[in-house]
C-alpha cells in the first residue's frame, strides 16, 4: 500500500496473508470459516499446496497469539481466468481447517450478487501487507489507504482499452500517489463494509494516477463464489461452518 497508514492492530480482522516459503506473497480475505478469497494470478506460477494462509495477523514477522495458520487444502481459480488480460482474476482458497472466529478473525461480507459497483467518487479502503513504495519496502504492519471509485470508462481509457466490465477502478482523488502495490494482490477493496473489489493489477508505478488501480469486481462473481463453497461442503459434515452474507 502506498500513501497509506498502518491500521490499528486487528481492526481489519477479515484480512488474510498468503505466504510461500515464509514470505508474504499475496493478500486475501475471509468469507467463510473454511474459505478465503484471493486473486487467481497469485497462483499462476505457484503451487497452492505449498502456500500458507495466516489469519488474525498484524505484523507478519512477529509471533502474535491471535494468528491462525492454515495450509491450502484446495485452490479454485475462476474457470475463465485469463492470465494475459487478468480477466476474472479471482480464486477461492479452502483452508485445511476451520478458522476460529473472534476479535482478530472475522468474516467480510460480499456485495449482493450482480449488485452495481459503488458510484464514481465513493470513498473506499484497500488494505494489505504489500510494499509501501516502488523500492519494495515491506510495511511495519497491515497498511490501509483511502481511495475513490473511478468511472470504469474513464479508467478503461487510461488503460488504453484493456479493461472489461467485471473490473473496478480506484484513484487517489488528487494527483498524489495512493493505492496498492506488489504483494497487495488478492486483498479487498472495502466500501460500506462489503468487499466490492479484489486487488488485481496496477501500472508501472504503485499509486500512479495515470494508470489507476484495477480490481476484480466482486459482485460479478458472488454466485460463482457461493456455488463453489456449497459444492465443496460435504453432506455428512457435522462441523458447524459460518459464512458471511
Amino acid at each position: 500500500i502506498v500513501g497509506g497508514h498502518e491500521v490499528t492492530p486487528h481492526s481489519r480482522p477479515y484480512m488474510a496473508s498468503v505466504s510461500f516459503e515464509g514470505h508474504h506473497y499475496c493478500g486475501g480475505f475471509l468469507i467463510h470459516t473454511h474459505w478465503v478469497v484471493s486473486a487467481a494470478h497469485c497462483f499462476s506460477d505457484r503451487d497452492p499446496s505449498m502456500g500458507l494462509v495466516v489469519l488474525g495477523a498484524h505484523a507478519l514477522l512477529a509471533p502474535e497469539p491471535t494468528q491462525q495458520t492454515f495450509s491450502i487444502a484446495a485452490a479454485v481459480s475462476h474457470p475463465d481466468f485469463q492470465p494475459a488480460t487478468q480477466a476474472n482474476d479471482i480464486c477461492l482458497l479452502r483452508l485445511n481447517g476451520s478458522a476460529v472466529l473472534g476479535p482478530a478473525v472475522r468474516l467480510l461480507r460480499l456485495p449482493r450478487r450482480n449488485a452495481k459497483p459503488p458510484a464514481a467518487g465513493t470513498r473506499c479502503h484497500v488494505s494489505g501487507w504489500g510494499f509501501v513504495s516502488d523500492f519494495e519496502e515491506p510495511p511495519p504492519g497491515l497498511m490501509e489507504v483511502e481511495v475513490r471509485i473511478l468511472d470504469l470508462s474513464v479508467c478503461n481509457s487510461s488503460w488504453q482499452g484493456q479493461l472489461n466490465p467485471a473490473m473496478l477502478c480506484t484513484h487517489s482523488g488528487d494527483r498524489r500517489r495512493r493505492g496498492f502495490c506488489s504483494a497487495d494482490s488478492g486483498g479487498p477493496l472495502v466500501c460500506g463494509r462489503r468487499a466490492h473489489g479484489l486487488v488485481s493489477f496496477s501500472g508501472l508505478w504503485c499509486g500512479d494516477p495515470k494508470t489507476p488501480d484495477v480490481y476484480t469486481q466482486v459482485s460479478a462473481f458472488v454466485t460463482w463464489i457461493w456455488d463453489v463453497v456449497r459444492a465443496s461442503s460435504s453432506p455428512g459434515s457435522t462441523g458447524r461452518s459460518v459464512r458471511a452474507v
Epitope: H41, S44, D45, P83, A84, T85, Q86, D89, F131, S133, D134, F135, E136, W159, Q160, Q162, C181, S182, F201, G203, L204, W205, C206, D208, P209, K210, T211, V214
Partner: antibody
Framework: EVQLVESGGGLVQPGGSLRLSCAAS????????IHWVRQAPGKGLEWVAW????????YYADSVKGRFTISADTSKNTAYLQMNSLRAEDTAVYYC????????????WGQGTLVTVSS | DIQMTQSPSSLSASVGDRVTITCRAS??????VAWYQQKPGKAPKLLIY???FLYSGVPSRFSGSGSGTDFTLTISSLQPEDFATYYC?????????FGQGTKVEIK
C-alpha cells in the same frame, strides 16, 4: 549474471511487420517488468512499451499504441514486440530493458537490434 | 506527458574537471528521476536512481541530487572513460520520459 539479448531486427518496407524478441537469463520474468526503449539514429531515447511481471497488463507510448503489441512467454523467459503498420519514423535501435525494483529505473539493457523501415 | 529538459545539450571539459548536468521536469516528479550514461554504439547504463541513489558498481565520483522539478548529475572529477552522452528519465507517472541528452566531449 543478468543478460538480455534482442533479435529480430532488420529492413522492412513501410506498412510491413516485424517481431522482436528479448531473451532473458539470470533472472525470472515473474519478478520484474520488461520494457522496450528505442533510439532513432543520432537521436535520444524514447520509451515504447512495458509488460508487467505477470504478463497480465501492458502499457504503450502514444506513438505506437494500436500498432505495437508487447507480450511475454514466461516459460521461455522471453519478451516480444510485435510491430505492425511500420512507418519510417519507427526506424531505430530497439532495446529491451529490465526494471529495477518496481520500475524505478532500467538497470539492465540488451545490446539492441536495429529496425530500418524504408522502401 | 511529462517533459524532461536537459541542459546543456553538450559541453566540453577536461580530465579532472567537475561537471554538472541539469534536468528540469515540466511538473513535480518528487525524486523519481534516474540518470544514464551511453557511449556510441552501446546500450545505456544506469548511474543514479531516485534522484540520488548511486547504482551498484557505479564509481562514487558520480552523484545526483534534486527533488520536485530540478535535478542535477555531478561528476566530481571527470575521467577519460566518462566522455559520453548522459540522459535523465522520470519514473513518476506514465509514460516514462527521457531528457534529450547531454553530450560530454573532450576539450
Amino acid at each position: 549474471e543478468v543478460q538480455l539479448v534482442e533479435s529480430g531486427g532488420g529492413l522492412v518496407q513501410p506498412g510491413g511487420s516485424l517481431r522482436l524478441s528479448c531473451a532473458a537469463s539470470g533472472f525470472t520474468f515473474s519478478g520484474s517488468g520488461i520494457h522496450w526503449v528505442r533510439q532513432a539514429p543520432g537521436k535520444g531515447l524514447e520509451w515504447v512499451a512495458w509488460i508487467s511481471p505477470t504478463g497480465g497488463n501492458t502499457y504503450y507510448a502514444d506513438s505506437v499504441k494500436g500498432r505495437f503489441t508487447i507480450s511475454a512467454d514466461t516459460s521461455k523467459n522471453t519478451a516480444y514486440l510485435q510491430m505492425n503498420s511500420l512507418r519510417a519514423e519507427d526506424t531505430a535501435v530497439y532495446y529491451c530493458a529490465k526494471s529495477l525494483f518496481h520500475n524505478v529505473a532500467f538497470d539492465y539493457w540488451g545490446q539492441g537490434t536495429l529496425v530500418t523501415v524504408s522502401s | 506527458d511529462i517533459q524532461m529538459t536537459q541542459s546543456p545539450s553538450s559541453l566540453s571539459a577536461s580530465v579532472g574537471d567537475r561537471v554538472t548536468i541539469t534536468c528540469r521536469a515540466s511538473q513535480d516528479v518528487s525524486t523519481a528521476v534516474a540518470w544514464y550514461q551511453q557511449k556510441p554504439g552501446k546500450a545505456p547504463k544506469l548511474l543514479i536512481y531516485s534522484a540520488s541513489f548511486l547504482y551498484s558498481g557505479v564509481p562514487s565520483r558520480f552523484s545526483g541530487s534534486g527533488s520536485g522539478t530540478d535535478f542535477t548529475l555531478t561528476i566530481s572529477s571527470l575521467q577519460p572513460e566518462d566522455f559520453a552522452t548522459y540522459y535523465c528519465q522520470q519514473s513518476y507517472t506514465a509514460p516514462p520520459t527521457f531528457g534529450q541528452g547531454t553530450k560530454v566531449e573532450i576539450k
